[in-house]
């Protein structure tokens, strides 16, 4: 009742290993690390066979098949490169995830290297089986913005890609007869969020309550350069409209809001986020130069119907930008206190413009980003949002534009976006 001699499978072994096997002896077949027992097309860790009464084995010896991790999971905004020849996905094969540069960067500077483990799972030393995260890069336009040495720029055409965070926000309130339409600007913070001024998104209500417009009434255009040609732009509807809970329509204090887009927008040379500043109550330093872009810069007397109807001469057809210095807080406060009317420049605001006038962002669009280049991080940072200006004509002498001081609201913004600040460190000015 002796059974025939057994040969272990290639890359495998049999236990116990004996010279002879008799009736009722049992053998366990297993494979080397990185291989699986394969029997009748079924993968298993081990396989047991028994020497039968008639001197035959209960089953044929199975084979050992190399573990296959199969095709790695797709990485949103990322790419996969195979380190091994023929794009092998078997045990000890290596792949590398990378992000779609220069628009996305891997969180925590992860290597992105994954190895096919003995368990048949792609594993990274730090993240384990979790995929890496590609975060949008911020504040790095595909075209370099002009040097900020020269003092005066005014109403200059922006080349496509100079302000890739610039959003045109069109609001059409169809609940009124006739429909109410207006527009403002905003700044892309991530693939799904736009930062803007609260007054742009406040409903045209009859009273002083702060109610946001219905999300159905909001359309956001990104990657837009010339308002006559929206074909190249990405337009998105809003999933959420969030006004700052303390926004005051009497004095425009806390004039900040967010729009969550219905779908994340694909980033590219003409659509990229701007960086948020550090949380700092001082805001931008006096005399620092910043840039603001908008389609409303050159002519403040045109209706919104004209700007959104393509093919007609409108405001500025092409995105314009203006360069402005930050004004010392005390000087701005004094300039407004000297005017008739109840003007209040709060600690949540800063001013920018020239004493002599001539350049002014009240010529820009409400909600547009006042950006300053940060030398440390070599990125553009949104320090202000176009909020309000004095009663005189735009660009009047000693009438400064007033901006929401974004650095006071960084925590609020992250909270609304549902991201802990540590997760999005690359987004923050360093």
């Amino acid at each position: 009742n002796e059974c025939p001699e057994l040969q272990p499978p290639v890359h495998g072994k049999i236990e116990p290993s004996q010279a002879k096997y008799f009736f009722k002896d049992q053998v366990l077949v297993s494979c080397d690390t990185g291989y699986k027992v394969l029997k009748d097309n079924v993968e298993m860790d081990t396989f047991q066979i028994e020497c039968l009464k008639d001197g035959t084995w209960s089953n044929k010896i199975p084979t050992c098949k190399i573990v296959d991790c199969r095709a790695p999971g797709e990485l949103e905004h990322g790419l996969i490169t195979f380190s091994t020849r023929n794009n092998l996905t078997t045990y000890k094969s290596e792949i590398k995830y990378s992000c779609q540069e220069p628009y996305y960067k891997m969180l925590n500077n992860n290597t992105g290297i994954y190895t096919c483990s003995a368990q048949g799972v792609w594993m990274n030393k730090v993240l384990g089986r979790s995929l890496p995260t590609c975060l949008p890069e911020c504040g790095q336009p595909s075209r370099s913005l002009p040097s900020l040495v020269k003092r005066i720029i005014g109403g200059r055409n922006a080349e496509p890609g100079l302000f890739p965070w610039q959003a045109l926000i069109v609001v059409e309130d169809t609940s009124r007869v006739p429909n109410d339409k207006w527009f403002g600007s905003g700044a892309l913070l991530s693939a799904s969020w736009i930062l803007t001024a609260a007054h742009v998104l406040r409903s045209q209500r009859r009273d002083t309550t702060v109610i946001p417009v219905s999300k159905e009434h909001v359309t956001v255009y990104l990657g837009l350069h010339d308002v006559r040609d929206k074909s190249g732009a990405v337009n998105s509807s809003a999933a959420r409209v969030v006004l700052h809970p303390d926004f005051n329509i009497q004095n425009y204090n806390h004039d900040i809001a967010l729009v969550q887009l219905q779908e994340p927008v694909p980033l590219g040379p003409h659509v990229m986020p701007v960086c948020l500043p550090r949380l700092e109550p001082e805001g931008p330093a006096p005399h620092m130069l910043g840039l603001v872009a908008g389609w409303g810069i050159s002519n403040p007397n045109v209706t919104v119907d004209e700007i959104i109807s393509s093919g007609t001469r409108t405001l500025s057809d092409v995105l314009q930008y203006v360069k402005l210095p930050v004004v010392p807080h005390a000087e701005c406060k004094t300039s407004y206190e000297s005017r008739s009317g109840n003007y209040s420049v709060t600690e949540n605001m800063f001013c920018a413009g020239y004493y002599e006038g001539g350049k002014d962002t009240c010529l820009g669009d409400s909600g547009g980003a006042f950006v300053i280049f940060d030398d440390l991080s070599q990125r553009w940072v949104v320090q202000g949002l176009v909020s309000w200006g004095g009663p005189e004509e735009c660009g009047s002498k000693q009438v400064y534009g007033v901006y929401t001081k974004v650095s006071n609201y960084v925590d609020w913004v992250w909270e609304q976006m549902g991201l802990p600040q540590s997760v999005v460190e690359p987004q923050v000015e360093r």
């Epitope: 169809t174 609940s175 009124r176 007869v177 006739p178 109410d180 339409k181 207006w182 403002g184 007054h199 742009v200 045209q204 009859r206 009273d207 109610i211 219905s214 007397n301 045109v302 209706t303 919104v304 409400s366």
Partner: antibody, heavy 113, light 112 residues
């Protein structure tokens, strides 16, 4: 075409309440504000308030807050205005209108003891 | 509240002549966001509800004869009937909807 048809005339005693209805047709009722305006005999027009039927949002003239209540029934495309604690000076024709453009025919409410 | 003051209170004009009604608001009705003046003009004939003639200060409602025109911005507005017809005899009201809406006291237009 857009039409607003209001309920018939009412005679009420001081202290009572009145509920005026306004049935809309010819457009999407839920998506447009319905305003309420009154006109005392031989007098001018006075805005009472408004309701957006789709959301139930309301805005009131301060003068009528607490006394006027607006409701809307989307299933019948009907808006309602209820005015409580009536006094003789509430005698007027009450109009509903779709935002600014189309007016109902008016409902005369007479408050008399 | 915004106070709307119409002038004159009444106006007698010969048929075919121009009628001009003024409306002054206690604060500007120009909305900086929409760049529109939230002022409307209504016509009311005896026993009828008011009828919208002009909105946004100068936009004529469809179906309204072009002899009716609106002008003005900020706080001063005008309704002009370029050539008065017999059917234009009515009371005319301005209404602001910039804020909690308020009406002017009305201007009665008659034939001289």
């Amino acid at each position: 075409q857009v039409q607003l048809v209001q309920s018939g005339a009412e005679v009420k005693k001081p202290g009572a309440s009145v509920k005026v209805s306004c049935k809309a047709s010819g457009y999407t009722f839920t998506g447009k504000w319905i305003e309420w305006v009154r006109q005392a005999p031989g007098q001018g027009l006075e805005w009472i308030g408004e309701i957006l039927p789709g959301t139930g949002s309301t805005n009131y003239n301060e003068k009528f807050k607490g006394r006027a209540t607006f409701t809307a029934d989307s299933s019948t495309s009907t808006a309602y205005m209820e005015l409580s604690s009536l006094r003789s000076e509430d005698t007027a024709v009450y109009y509903c209108l779709r935002s600014e453009d189309v007016w109902g025919q008016g409902t005369l409410v007479t408050v008399s003891s | 509240d915004i106070v709307m003051t119409q002038s004159p209170d009444s106006l007698a004009v010969s048929l075919g002549e121009r009628a001009t009604i003024n409306c002054k608001s206690s604060q500007s009705l120009l909305n900086s966001r929409t760049r529109k003046n939230y002022l409307a003009w209504y016509q009311q004939k005896p026993g009828q509800p008011p009828k919208l003639l002009i909105y946004w200060a100068s936009t004529r409602e469809s179906g309204v004869p072009d002899r009716f025109s609106g002008s003005g911005s900020g706080t001063d507005f005008t309704l002009t009937i370029s050539s008065l017809q017999a059917e234009d005899v009515a009371v005319y009201y301005c209404k602001q909807s910039y804020n909690i809406p308020t009406f002017g006291q009305g201007t009665k237009v008659e034939i001289k």
